[in-house]
Interface confidence: low
């Protein structure tokens, strides 16, 4: 039959070459002369010329040594043709399998492997995996089967067998207890990979195991007792810096300190923060301390870490005795902001109120008073009694100084301490309206035609508050009523001015008296420009030579 079984050829053959491998034979050679040829990669296509065939005998020839790691299998086709070139057989598949020899050593994928494991872990904890490769065959032979081993460990503390490596996977694990970062922060392992499943060629590499920090050391106060002095009333004042030592890795959560005031801060006066660089505890005042109430505080501060302890550890406690120093304190107005109702326009010299301060200090200090801010200069304050008196006319309608009926004054109290201290208070005078403003019309200039004149509507305003405002009443005076009429509308907030007799083109004064609900009267002169025109006008038409 025109078939050939797969041919096995070992790699790295010594020859001599060409080397006969197998004979192709067609049974058609009984009838006619047959010529043999081969095609395919390794024959007539790259890599060309590795194989050849004796044309007339059909012997398959190997022309040079093979390398399994380069090409492990060749697939060729055998051809048989008669003398006239006609094909006598279908092309035949020829498989040439290159068999492996152990011609490669294992190779680690890295010269140095790096891994890490927490200190104090239990035996059996996986650390890292190393890998070596071998180009030889590991399926049909052991040539490429790698076995891993640890050759040496440095340092050999606490002993020389702290780690093990899985023979076939390369996984490095902890085999003994006693990993302590504070004693040995790093191990260097020399590892081996051997082919033939441990009986062949060997290569080495280094595995560096970093021992990671666990919070297995508590921070300790050094010293444990402190004395500090703080002036009373100081807020945000640094009282004391507390120092700790911690054997864990600097600047890690296992080293960074967390401080807690465990006792002694009954009034919630203190706070403690951690300095980001030094790790010190910075004790500061959250609120002012009061010498008169308590002149000494004893605080108990406990320190732990940002990270929880991995095992039960005793915590360190510091004692801080804080001595409060007496300070001359500022007088305090009672209340800090005082509202007083007072009628506007009260006579000069009239008392407005008494506004006094108390001194927190225990000594009987003398307090003197003065006005600190009185925008309109309306008030005076007795330096001894704190009595506030009107020295100017309080005017509710003064928009410059009065907002929403309130006139705001700031007063100052000063004690006779050494040095003297001052406190301020706010006096809010609610000014009660009196009927001190008459109604005023707007606008005060009008332009009107002397024929079919349009009624002029004037708005009435009164700076006072109700009931000292509308309804308003209007009256024309000084003979203005001969030519004009003035009527207040139903709502009582506008006045309608009408020209009732013909006037020649000119400018006239209309004397209008308006009075409010409280009969406060205000006389206003309206400047009326009369024009020669009909109906509505804004400016007189034509040349205008009026006054």
């Amino acid at each position: 039959d025109w078939v050939v079984a797969p041919i096995s050829v070992p790699e790295n053959g010594k020859g001599p070459f060409p080397q006969r491998l197998n004979q192709l034979k067609s049974n058609k050679d009984r009838d006619t002369k047959i010529f043999y040829s081969i095609t395919g990669p390794g024959a007539d296509s790259p890599p060309e010329g590795v194989f050849a065939v004796e044309k007339e005998t059909g012997w398959l020839l190997l022309n040079k040594p093979l390398d399994r790691e380069e090409i492990a299998k060749y697939e060729l086709f055998g051809h048989a043709v008669s003398e006239n070139g006609a094909s006598v057989e279908d092309p035949m598949n020829i498989s040439i399998i290159v068999t492996d020899q152990n011609d490669h050593k294992p190779k680690f994928t890295q010269d140095t492997f790096r891994g890490s494991v927490l200190e104090g872990v239990l035996p059996g904890t996986s650390v890292m995996q190393v890998t070596a490769t071998d180009e030889d065959d590991a399926i049909y032979t052991y040539n490429g089967v790698v076995a891993y081993s640890i050759h040496s460990q440095e340092p050999k503390d606490p002993h020389d067998l702290m780690f093990t490596i899985h023979r076939s996977t390369g996984t490095i694990s902890v085999i003994s207890s006693g990993l302590d970062r504070e004693k040995v922060p790093e191990y260097t392992l020399t590892i081996q990979a051997t082919d033939m499943d441990g009986d062949g060629s060997t290569t080495t590499a280094v595995a560096v195991v970093e021992i990671l920090d666990a919070n297995d050391n508590a921070p300790m106060f050094d010293p444990q007792k402190y004395e500090a002095h703080v002036p009373e009333n100081a807020v945000g004042h640094e009282v004391q810096r507390l120092t700790v030592t911690d054997l864990d890795a600097p600047n890690s959560p296992a080293w960074r300190a967390t401080y807690l005031i465990m006792g002694g801060d009954d009034g919630d006066h203190f706070t403690i923060t951690t300095h980001p660089e030094s790790n010190q505890g910075i004790l500061t005042t959250r609120k002012g301390l009061d010498f008169e109430a308590k002149n000494q505080h004893t605080l108990y501060v406990e320190v732990t870490n940002e990270a929880p302890f991995v095992l039960k550890l005793p915590t360190s406690t510091a004692t801080i005795v804080v001595h409060v120093e007496d300070v001359n304190e500022a007088p305090v107005f009672v209340p800090p902001s005082k509202v007083v109702e007072v009628q506007e326009g009260i006579p000069t010299g009239e008392p407005v109120c008494v506004y006094t301060a108390e001194d927190p200090d225990k000594e009987n200090q003398k307090i003197s008073y003065r006005i600190l801010r009185d925008p309109a200069g309306w008030l005076a304050m007795d330096p001894d009694s704190g009595q506030v008196t009107a020295v100017g006319t309080l005017d509710r309608e003064d928009e410059q100084f009065v907002r929403n009926n309130i006139y705001e004054v700031m007063v100052l109290a000063m004690d006779n301490g050494s040095p003297p201290t001052t406190g301020t208070g706010t006096l809010l005078l609610t000014l009660i309206d009196v009927n001190d403003h008459g109604p005023v019309p707007e606008p005060r200039q009008i332009t009107i035609c002397n024929q079919s004149p349009v009624r002029q509507v004037l708005n009435i305003t009164d700076k006072d508050l109700s009931p000292h405002t509308s309804p308003f009443q209007a009256q024309l005076t000084d003979d203005s009523d001969i030519y004009w009429t003035a009527e207040v509308n139903e709502e009582g907030d506008t006045v309608v001015l009408s020209l009732k007799k013909f006037l020649k083109q000119d400018t006239y004064d209309v004397h209008l008296s308006l009075s409010d609900h409280g009969n406060k009267e205000q006389l206003t002169v309206i400047r009326a420009t009369v024009c020669d025109c009909h109906g509505h006008v804004e400016t007189c038409p034509g040349p205008w030579k009026g006054g």
Epitope: L372, R373, P375, T424
Partner: antibody, heavy 119, light 107 residues
Framework: QVQLQESGPELVKPGASVKMSCKAS????????MHWVKQSHGKSLEWIGF????????TYNQTFKGKATLTVDKSSSTAYMQLNSLTSEDSAVYYC????????????WGQGTTLTVSS | DIQMTQTTSSLSASLGDRVTISCRAS??????LNWYQQKPDGTVKLLIY???RLHSGVPSRFSGSGSGTDYSLTISNLEQEDIATYFC?????????FGGGTKLEIK
């Protein structure tokens, strides 16, 4: 003597915020209102607003509402102004100024903080 | 808002001259007018408040006058140290507004 010490020059990117300070000394900080004024390059002065350090009450120029935020820290006698959503239009010198009593105008001024807004 | 107008943006004068800088308000500001001096280095000082009152420490050669909408600042005897930009400011109504400034230079 009365002094208003403003913070140093600022270079910031558009869209960012900036907070400048004005430290007062030589007088009772809470007794006087603190005003802020803007001066764009080669231009006149624009009033931003003021804060009463005693009460914390703030009055803004409508033009600067939402742009400027005024605060004070009484313990350090310092006034602050924060400007947000910055654009090149905000590049200017900003002054803090103390308001005198009664009709006294702005009787003492800081040296000014130069703000440059640029990408 | 009240507009403050300083019509003269720059002014040249000789040392010893009497110099007047004017300022106009868009409405009556009832004497609530202040004058400020800004030196070339940016330093700002109050000179005059409430139209004519001299701020403490300001030389008496500076004076102010005016009423209603028209105000002026006068330097009676110009000195080298007076080279600056002068701003008027109204304190009558919110928002407080400033004039455009008058830059004073030496001839």
């Amino acid at each position: 003597q009365v002094q208003l010490q403003e913070s140093g020059p600022e270079l910031v990117k558009p869209g960012a915020s900036v907070k400048m300070s004005c430290k007062a000394s030589g007088y009772s900080f809470t007794a006087y209102n603190m005003h802020w004024v803007k001066q764009s390059h080669g231009k006149s002065l624009e009033w931003i607003g003021f804060i009463d350090p005693y009460s914390g009450i703030i009055t803004y120029n409508q033009t600067f509402k939402g742009k400027a935020t005024l605060t004070v820290d009484k313990s350090s006698s310092t006034a602050y102004m924060q400007l947000n959503s910055l654009t090149s239009e905000d590049s200017a010198v900003y002054y803090c100024a103390r308001r005198g009593y009664y009709d006294g105008g702005f009787d003492y001024w800081g040296q000014g903080t130069t703000l440059t807004v640029s990408s | 808002d009240i507009q403050m107008t300083q019509t003269t943006s720059s002014l040249s004068a000789s040392l010893g001259d009497r110099v007047t800088i004017s300022c106009r308000a868009s409405q009556d500001i009832t004497n609530y007018l202040n004058w400020y001096q800004q030196k070339p280095d940016g330093t700002v000082k109050l000179l005059i408040y409430y139209t004519s009152r001299l701020h403490s420490g300001v030389p008496s050669r500076f004076s102010g006058s005016g009423s209603g909408t028209d105000y002026s600042l006068t330097i009676s005897n110009l000195e080298q140290e007076d080279i600056a930009t002068y701003f008027c400011q109204q304190d009558s109504k919110h928002p407080r507004t400033f004039g455009g400034g008058t830059k004073l230079e030496i001839k």
